[in-house]
């Protein structure tokens, strides 16, 4: 191999290069100088660098490093941000459809309960949305409030329609009776169980995605230490001081430097791997009562069944409540029982015709597969950055931080570095405080994800099975049904593929959300253009 070319006798090349970094030439010597004031690019002989230039190189090196890190994480960051937004919107659409289904059920079967029922339904689904988004909401509370509010209206409108307005004073007694007499049977408890399980999982899923974004944002905007800045300067710029403008750093040397610079970041790796695997476990368990799409879209049916339960026991209930709430009423009113409210409209509400098999669950699985390709993201970062910055192939005729070498030797390079700074010391410092914080957050979410994840192979939740809550389940075959089985209920083939927006025709004139919520928004359709087309179920 030919010996390295002698340094530029006039520093001309160095001057022209440096001018691109820093307009003006006042810091660049015209000819090589001893460079005794240099602290990073320690010269073996005359040098074309000054202390000011060295400082500028350090700043530029750290900025370069930040940009490399940001470009390295760009694809992963976009993947999580996009999916977090898509899932959040999708969950909101599910909630809105569930609300519309429930309102339609009241409109079709119990018109005398509207608009009060619409109000209670609206309140319930508002709480569902707030819970998913992380608000301090208690699921049992929201279910209790729904049934507490519904029963007085059912009693005064369906069971005792002769009651005058003044009898509204018995509302409080009726709210109490609702729980004491278990007027809705086990239905409120069933809904509590299903809703809390499915929403808990949904909420943690969204929380986990949002934390994923926070992790990437944190490592994306790391400020590298001065020690790292010196290492990077030595690797990328010190060769220029010797006039070696075209020389590239040795690949092995780059890896050593990057591992030193990113020692703290790489500590995230263990927890990042666990995060992706725990998220995968959670997603694998998101079916049946752990799938909010399945649970919420079937709620209208369970609520309908609960009202039928009250109606079946109306005679007995009216007598008991008449005695219980007698002090609230001046006199007893006749218990009228109107068949049109008792029997469900025989026209079966036709279900969506599914053209594509894509659902939220397949979208979730797709996300996990993509995330798994980034499972080694943090451990692979040093190597990734070296492969995306100029390094000499095969470690031949390359820069080792001090000189141009024919072949890179890690041992020699380390010995040469000893006087300049201690690489081992840099590694021992531990992660930055922000990295430690994000590791703590990852540990916390991983723990939550683990506690949420169901044991593999479990078909039914043990507690539910014991209490017989899922007896109406239609099994694990392709034709799953949601909720109850009364006439007029929606049978669902492979769950409702509500994506893209169901075209509603609820014909709910006085319903809150009549035309507004019945009409799909264009942007929702475009968001889910590839997630399946569905025809209107509620004609």
């Amino acid at each position: 191999q030919p010996p390295p070319p002698p340094p530029d006798a006039t520093c001309h090349q160095v001057r022209s290069f440096f001018q691109r970094l820093q307009p003006g030439l006042k810091w660049v010597p015209e000819t090589p100088v001893p460079g005794s004031d240099l602290q990073v690019c320690l010269p073996k002989g005359p040098t074309c660098c000054s202390r000011k230039m060295e400082e500028k190189y350090q700043l530029t090196a750290r900025l370069n490093m930040e940009q490399l890190l940001q470009s390295a994480s760009m694809e992963l960051k976009f993947l999580i941000i996009q999916n977090a937004a898509v899932f959040q919107e999708a969950f909101e659409i599910v909630v809105r459809h569930a609300k519309n289904y429930t309102n339609a059920m009241f409109k079709n079967n119990y018109p005398s309960l509207t608009p009060q029922a619409f109000e209670f339904v609206g309140e319930f689904f508002t709480d569902v949305s707030l819970y998913i988004l992380g608000s301090d909401i208690n699921v049992d509370d929201m279910v209790n409030e729904l049934f507490d509010s519904l029963f007085p209206v059912i009693y005064t409108q369906l069971m005792n329609p002769g009651l005058p307005d003044s009898a509204l004073d018995i509302n409080e007694c009726l709210r109490g009776a609702r729980r004491d007499l278990k007027v809705f049977g086990n239905f409120p408890k069933l809904i509590m169980t299903q809703v809390s399980k499915s929403l808990q999982v949904t909420r943690i899923f969204l929380q986990a995605l949002n934390l994923g974004i926070e992790v990437i944002n944190t490592t994306d905007h790391l400020k590298f230490s001065k020690d790292c800045g010196r290492m990077l300067t030595r690797m990328w710029y010190c060769s220029y001081c010797q006039g070696l403008m075209m020389v590239k750093p040795c690949g092995g040397y780059c890896n050593v430097v990057m591992q030193g610079c990113m020692a703290g970041v790489v500590e995230i790796d263990k927890y990042w791997r666990e995060y992706i695997l725990s998220l995968e476990e959670l997603v694998n368990g998101m079916y049946r009562i752990y799938d909010m799409e399945n649970v919420l879209l079937g709620l209208f049916s369970t609520i309908h069944d609960s009202i039928q339960y009250v109606q079946k026991n109306a005679g007995k209930l009216t007598t008991t409540i008449g005695k219980l709430c007698a002090h609230s009423q001046q006199r007893q009113y006749r218990s009228a029982y109107y068949p049109e409210d008792l029997f469900i409209d025989k026209k079966v509400l036709k279900v969506a015709h599914v053209e594509h098999e894509e659902t939220l669950s397949s979208r979730r699985r797709e996300l996990i597969q993509k995330l798994k390709s980034f499972i080694s993201f943090y451990s692979a970062l040093p190597g990734y950055i070296c492969s995306h910055s100029p390094v000499a192939e095969n470690d031949t005729l390359c820069w080792n931080g001090q000189e141009l070498v024919e072949r890179y030797s890690q041992k020699a390079a380390r010995n040469g570095m000893k006087n300049q700074f201690n690489l081992h010391e840099l590694k021992m410092k531990g992660p930055e405080p922000v990295v430690s914080q994000i590791i703590d957050k990852l540990k916390h979410i991983n723990q939550l994800l683990r506690t949420m994840s169901m044991p593999k192979g479990r078909v039914l939740d043990k507690n539910l099975d014991e209490e017989g809550f899922e007896s109406g389940d239609c099994g694990d075959d392709e034709d799953e049904c949601i909720g109850g089985s009364g006439d007029g209920m929606i049978k669902v083939k492979n769950q409702l593929r509500f994506l893209a927006e169901l075209a509603y025709d609820l014909d709910v004139d006085d319903a809150p959300g009549n035309s507004q919520q019945a009409t799909p928004k264009d942007n929702e359709i475009s968001t889910f253009h590839n997630l399946g087309n569905v025809h209107s179920p509620l004609k």
Partner: antibody, heavy 116, light 110 residues
Framework: EVQLLESGGGLVQPGGSLRLSCAAS????????MSWVRQAPGKGLEWVSA????????YYADSVKGRFTISRDNSKNTLYLQMNSLRAEDTAVYYC?????????WGQGTMVTVSS | QSVLTQPPSASGTPGQRVTISCSGG????????VNWYQQLPGTAPKLLIY???QRPSGVPDRFSGSKSGTSASLAISGLQSEDEADYYC???????????FGGGTKLTVL
Amino acid sequence: EVQLLESGGGLVQPGGSLRLSCAASGFTFSSYAMSWVRQAPGKGLEWVSAISGSGGSTYYADSVKGRFTISRDNSKNTLYLQMNSLRAEDTAVYYCAKGKRYFDYWGQGTMVTVSS
Amino acid sequence: QSVLTQPPSASGTPGQRVTISCSGGSSDIGSNTVNWYQQLPGTAPKLLIYYNNQRPSGVPDRFSGSKSGTSASLAISGLQSEDEADYYCATWDDRMYSPVFGGGTKLTVL
């Protein structure tokens, strides 16, 4: 007869704290969600916060989130509003009201003045 | 700035019929029921109408409410001097996840 009686208002400096109370009677307190609604002098009504019957669910207006905390003691039939980091714009009459989406009974209100 | 829009003032002579309007959008009035409150000078508000058109016991049937699309209105027939007060419409806002009020209408009985 339903009665709601607020107390705890007064003059406080910006950045200071106050705790409002609302004593309820005439209904089964634990069965109902309760709210705080305020009215700045000469202005309209603004919902501030709500809490479910059991106290398990809490709701806040964006303007007070992170500064105010609603709570209740069902054994004492009392609703509370802990107000921290008070600002001049929090100056208002604070009403305690029964309900969450609509308010069928209101207290007479307690005046909170935030001024240096 | 209130989410719901009400005229700042309205007036009428005793015995007359007065209507107060309340205008909103698809995420508030369009999706939820409307309530009306009456606030007599120097007193706390009082529920006047709930669920668009329901009157609590004790509220005279001179007061009636209605809702259509994204608007609501309160009608007072046979206006009386004791009806002089501020009237507020209110509903739930699905976007803000909270109850919202109109700016209030000051009713003067001439």
